[in-house]
Amino acid sequence: MKVLQEPTCVSDYMSISTCEWKMGGPTNCSAELRLLYQLVFQSSETHTCVPENNGGVGCVCHLLMDDVVSMDNYTLDLWAGQQLLWKGSFKPSEHVKPRAPGNLTVHTNVSDTVLLTWSNPYPPDNYLYNDLTYAVNIWNENDLADSRIHNVTYLKPTLRIPASTLKSGISYRARVRAWAQHYNTTWSEWSPSTKWYNSYREPFEQR
């Protein structure tokens, strides 16, 4: 049994780190492999992650962690039974992928404005809470070429756009993702998308 692509891990900088790797051939990850992880600290335990399949030769493990701090470092050991396949380390603070924003809602009750709101995925005591900026993707359900990205570089998780910038009588979808500038993170996954109907009509004299 051989590791083809070594484990790479990303942390949500809260409680979960996700590690993925590829094996040299088809593998039943949960039956054959174990990923052991331990915080480099004298009295910490070695926890065991039972991986799950991620495609024919891919495996994924979710490591459960304490609230992460910048100096935390974990040792990782990938085992197949009593055979050590790979040994490595992982510093969560250096490989952050934020959680996806949630509760994306579209408010269209203001006549000429579409208001999008969403929730910051972190509690206020988390370091990332005040460091997130967002990208909002809005697209026309019937015309994928009619798609745009709005960068939200302020802290408030809201976006206002004039309804007039969208085609009238068309269904649109929106989704949002986040990243944290000061932690040099990757982008989060996109939030689930939300659909709405743009019923805005231009005033009669402008037609």
Partner: antibody, heavy 129, light 109 residues
């Protein structure tokens, strides 16, 4: 210093109840591990009672003999784990240890306790009339 | 719940002896087995976890082996401070239960 300190032991009459406490210091009792209770009757071996996951999910596991009479709970704000014991019998007389445990997880919701790494000094419970 | 059968229940040995204690699980527990040392009036001390991994600060004369159902604790050269009671602890995947063996008391011959 990382340590666990049990309290609440003492003499209790048969049929009575008692709540033991385990105060954690040097680490957060809400972090990713299990907090467990183990007991040892005088001159006998070690007996696992149960565990509670100290992270956000708070799942519990109990030995089959302990289900119903024994309940483990936690108060993360006080960094404390509790063992509530009801309908006590003479055979429950033992030293009760609190222990921190490693875990095995599959995904983020299937987590179970593994070995006990850090132990308290124990508190003696005597059930007698 | 699983059962853990530990043997012998007691043994007498001299300083310098090689000592072996075995533990058998009633079902396959992979490598989810730990060994503890306990001295009178004290809490147990972790020696080995995952069947063969030495815990922090434990002398290298202690070693563990086995997987599945059969496990062994070996003390390669018994020292005066090793006279104590030893317990195995098996952890069951299927039920989430943890069961101790009955213990082995190592006494001075």
């Amino acid at each position: 210093e990382v340590q666990l300190v049990e309290s609440g032991g003492g003499l209790v009459q048969p049929g009575g109840s008692l709540r033991l406490s385990c105060a954690a210091s040097g680490f957060s009792s809400s972090s990713a591990h299990y907090m467990c209770w183990v007991r040892q009757a005088p001159g006998k071996g070690l007996e696992w009672i149960g565990c509670i996951y100290a992270g956000s999910r708070g799942s519990t596991y109990y030995a089959s003999w302990a289900k119903g009479r024994f309940t483990i709970s936690r108060d993360n704000s006080k960094n404390t784990v509790y063992l509530q014991m009801n309908s006590l019998r003479a055979e429950d007389t033992a030293v009760y240890y609190c222990a921190r445990a490693a875990f095995v997880n599959r995904g983020v919701s299937w987590i179970w306790p593994y070995y006990f790494s850090l132990w308290g000094q124990g508190t003696l419970v005597t059930v007698s009339s | 719940d699983i059962q853990m059968t530990q043997s012998p229940s007691s043994l007498s040995a001299r300083v310098g002896d090689r000592v072996t204690i075995t533990c058998q699980a009633s079902e396959d527990i992979e490598s989810y087995l730990a060994w503890y040392q306990q001295k009178p009036g004290k809490a147990p001390k972790l020696l080995i976890y995952r069947a063969s991994t030495l815990a922090y600060g434990v002398p290298s004369r202690f070693s563990g082996s086995g997987s599945g159902r059969d496990f062994t604790l070996t003390i390669s050269s018994l020292q005066p401070e090793d006279f104590a009671t030893y317990y195995c602890l098996g952890s069951s995947y299927s039920t989430g239960s943890n069961i101790f063996g009955q213990g082995t008391k190592v006494e001075i011959k």
